[in-house]
């Protein structure tokens, strides 16, 4: 209810004689700050005095703290929130109930905390997962309901009394909810750990033993097996007997089935721990093992390799590889099933014994045509000699020889001609089945080994062919040496590097990219007029009249090629300036007169200036000077100046005459 003080702390704390107790505690008083605090041991309420009786372990009042038990008991709290306590060292007779008597200005409260102090350090508790399986990582937990700042402890893990290699993670809790020390060990148990004893040992800071807890590991695992064979080397001859025995060294839980496997396949009706093979045949050679299962899964023994010995069987020859390419290496392998392996071989070529060849393999590093034919062999081991089996045929093959590309056309070849080539060869095994041509193009092959190039390109330089059977043999490339008119003719200005101004020295170059034949002639033309026959066209002092459209022509014995028209532009200052007057140079007063500054300039005039007969500049800057209404006083000589990016030019004087109107004359 709302009349209670609110406390939070562990319900019971555990310790042992000589250790310490740290009591984490928080509280909230009903009103105001704490004024008095008394820590009782086993407090009892006295109805007569309306007070609590019991041993006072600690006392704190407004007047100051009363030293108690030489600071063995400490109140580490404050006046409004914290009520943490420490008892160091703690004694057996501290067991029981601690009473925290709290008083504020108007309220009182007694809070009880249980303390359980044992005579000796109590053991930790090991927690195991419900099931442990071999090779599956598990976490072993060791929990001790104790932790105190003033008394460091450690938890150590032992397996059969020996410290465990795996790193443990130790954590402590000293909170109002719980007080404990915990060690967690991650561990991947093997089957051999089954039945072993794991210990969690509590030690003090110096490693001195305090207490421990032990558990026996119950590690579930598949059966672990041992296989024995008689005879022990598992080598017998056909007709002998063999016994294999399977024994379980460990299984948890108990095993439920047993079977035998040969080369990984289960043997039917063999469900005992002993396998008896009577009068064995060579087919019974192989790898044997026993498989025993329990609820975890199957376990397999090591494999026993049973070898049933017999004389070589009729042999066969394997050729690596036939057909063989002339010049390549070939290996012949004599294959004969035998146990033990054959120790000696006899080789035959076309029925004739090959001297000095006694190995399983015959290696010929460089095959020649005469090596073709039938190869056979005979194998021999300690139990006898085999029979000569059917031979193997060696076929020696080679790529087409002496391949040439032949041009069928008369020479020279000109751009646009139709060119026919043929691909010839001397000999081939196997027969030629196809031809290849380099480079590739959209060309016709009217018949096998013939190539027709319609409209041959100027850049078709060389052609090569290959005659192909299983391999392709390439001929040396032949040059078509295609002749063509000059290509990519263009006009290029050599000087000046920048724009052309009147009076500059100008050079134009007639360029082309290629020509075959190389001997060429040049022609320069402007507006249909021949100007020169050199590769360059030079102007010592260019004039505006030289501007226009220029072309150059380059020709050889095949034809001629013209450049695109190239425009020559000449920049010059305004020239030929004159002032024209409209409607004329004699105008009646009151009318309108327009003066126009006419000029020839490249680039066009960008700025005009007008001057009168006194060389006085007028405030007009456009090409036309409009006087309206014109007055007699406007009579006089005018001139203009034109300006562009190249320079300035001026006109001669032009006189404007303004005469009186009849009205003015009439008034006089």
């Amino acid at each position: 209810d709302s009349s209670k003080w609110v406390f939070e702390h562990p319900e019971t704390l555990y310790a042992w004689e000589g250790a310490c107790v740290w009591i984490p505690c928080t509280y909230r008083a009903l009103d105001g700050d704490l004024e008095s605090f008394i820590l009782f041991h086993n407090p009892e309420y006295n109805k007569n005095t309306s007070k609590f009786d019991g041993t006072r372990l600690y006392e704190s009042t407004k007047d100051g703290k009363v030293p108690s038990e030489q600071k063995r008991v400490q109140f580490l709290g404050d006046k409004n929130k914290n009520c943490t306590l420490s008892i160091h060292p703690v004694h057996l007779n501290d067991s029981g109930q601690l009473g925290l008597r709290m008083e504020s200005k108007t309220e009182k409260w007694m809070e009880r905390i249980h303390l359980n102090v044992s005579e000796r350090p109590f053991p930790p508790h090991i927690q195991l997962p419900p099931e442990i399986q071999e090779s599956q990582e598990v976490t072993l937990t060791c929990l001790l309901n104790f932790s105190c700042y003033g008394y460091p402890i450690q938890l150590q893990w032992l397996l059969e009394g020996v410290p465990m290699r795996q790193a443990a993670v130790t954590s402590t809790s000293l909170t109002i909810k719980s007080v404990f020390t915990r060690s967690e060990l991650k561990f991947s148990p093997q089957w051999s750990h089954h039945g072993k004893i794991v210990t969690c040992q509590l030690q003090d800071a110096d490693g001195k033993f305090l207490s421990n807890d032990t558990v026996q590991l119950n590690v579930k695992h598949t059966p672990k097996l041992e296989i024995k064979v008689t005879p022990s080397d598992a080598i017998v001859r056909e007709g002998d007997s063999v016994t294999m025995t399977c024994e379980v060294s460990s299984s948890n839980p108990e095993y439920t089935t047993v079977s035998w496997l040969k080369d990984g396949t289960s043997l039917k009706k063999q469900n005992t721990f002993t396998l008896n093979l009577r009068e064995v045949t060579k087919d019974q050679s192989g790898k044997y093992c026993c498989q025993v299962s329990n609820d975890v899964g199957p376990g397999r023994s090591e494999e026993v390799f049973l070898q049933v010995q017999y004389a070589p069987e009729p042999s066969t020859v394997q050729i690596l590889h036939s057909p063989a390419v002339e010049g390549s290496q070939v290996e012949f392998l004599c294959m004969s099933l035998a146990n033990p392996l054959p120790t000696n071989y006899t080789w035959y070529h076309n029925g004739k014994e090959m001297q000095g060849r006694t190995e399983e393999k015959v290696h010929i590093p460089k095959i020649l045509p005469w090596h073709a034919g039938t190869y056979s062999c005979v194998a021999e081991n300690i139990l006898g000699t085999g029979q000569r089996g059917p031979g193997a045929e060696l076929d020696v093959q080679y790529p087409p020889k002496k391949v040439t590309t032949v041009i069928q056309n008369p020479m020279p070849i000109r751009e646009g001609d139709t060119v026919t080539l043929s691909c010839n060869y001397n000999s081939s095994n196997p027969s030629v089945t196809r031809y290849e041509w380099k480079p590739h193009g959209a060309w016709e092959e009217p018949s096998l080994g013939v190539l027709k190039i319609q409209n041959v390109g100027w850049d078709n330089t060389t052609i090569a062919c290959a005659a192909c059977n299983s391999w392709c043999s390439w001929a040396s490339p032949v040059a078509l040496n295609v002749q063509y008119a000059p290509r990519d003719v263009r006009v290029r200005k050599i000087k000046p590097l920048s724009e052309i101004h009147s009076g500059n020295s100008v050079s134009l170059q007639c360029d082309f990219s290629s020509s075959h034949p190389k001997e060429v002639q040049f022609f320069w033309e402007k507006n249909g007029r021949l100007l020169g026959k050199e590769s360059q066209l030079n102007f010592d002092s260019i004039s505006p009249e030289d501007a226009g459209s220029y072309s150059c022509w380059v020709n050889n014995s095949i034809g001629q090629t013209a450049s695109k028209a190239w425009t020559l532009e000449v920049l010059y200052a305004p020239r030929r300036l004159r002032v024209s007057m409209s409607p004329g140079d004699q105008v009646m007063e009151g009318k309108s007169a327009t003066l126009t500054c006419e000029s020839d300039a490249n680039p066009p005039v960008s700025h005009y200036t007008w001057f009168d007969w006194n060389n006085q500049s007028l405030p007009y800057h456009s090409q036309k000077l409009r006087l309206e209404p014109v007055k007699v006083q406007h009579s006089g000589a005018y001139w203009c100046q034109g300006t562009n990016s190249v320079g300035k030019g001026r006109s001669p004087l032009s006189t404007l005459t303004v005469y009186y109107s009849p009205e003015t004359i009439g008034r006089r």
């Epitope: 039945g195 672990k224 024994e247 379980v248 060294s249 460990s250 299984s251 108990e254 721990f273 002993t274």
Partner: nanobody, 125 residues
């Protein structure tokens, strides 16, 4: 379920011999690892000897080594404990036990799932 029955116990003089037999049924006999244990009055159960399925592995306690011999006949589904040079301290109830967990922990009674009733062996001085 495996049933185990012992026989062959009795009274014998110090230095004498006895042969105990252990018959098992319910499973093929070569599936079973067989062990002999004894318990004297007021004492804990003690391991005596054990034999693997085929007889390839045999284990003895130090106290009986050289005097007792364990063997088995899988064709007759029986195991034997031949006890020679008997001493008064060999007096106990001898129990035969069987298991299908392998021989690696054959000396530990908690590995055995199937037990006989036991047969009394008394060695008088």
């Amino acid at each position: 379920e495996v049933q185990v029955v012992e026989s062959g116990g009795g009274l014998v003089q110090t230095g004498g011999s006895l042969r105990l037999s252990c018959a098992a049924s319910g499973r093929p006999f070569d599936w079973l690892t067989v062990g002999w244990f004894r318990q004297a009055p007021g004492k804990e159960r003690e391991f005596v000897a054990a034999i693997s399925q085929s007889g390839g592995r045999i284990f003895y306690s130090d106290s009986v080594k050289g005097r007792f011999t364990i063997s088995r006949d899988n064709a007759k589904n029986t195991a034997f404990l031949q006890m020679n040079s008997l001493k008064p301290e060999d007096t106990a109830v001898y129990s035969c036990a069987a298991q299908m967990r392998g021989y690696s922990r054959a000396a530990y009674p908690d590995e055995y799932d199937y037990w006989g009733q036991g047969t009394q062996v008394t060695v008088s001085s």
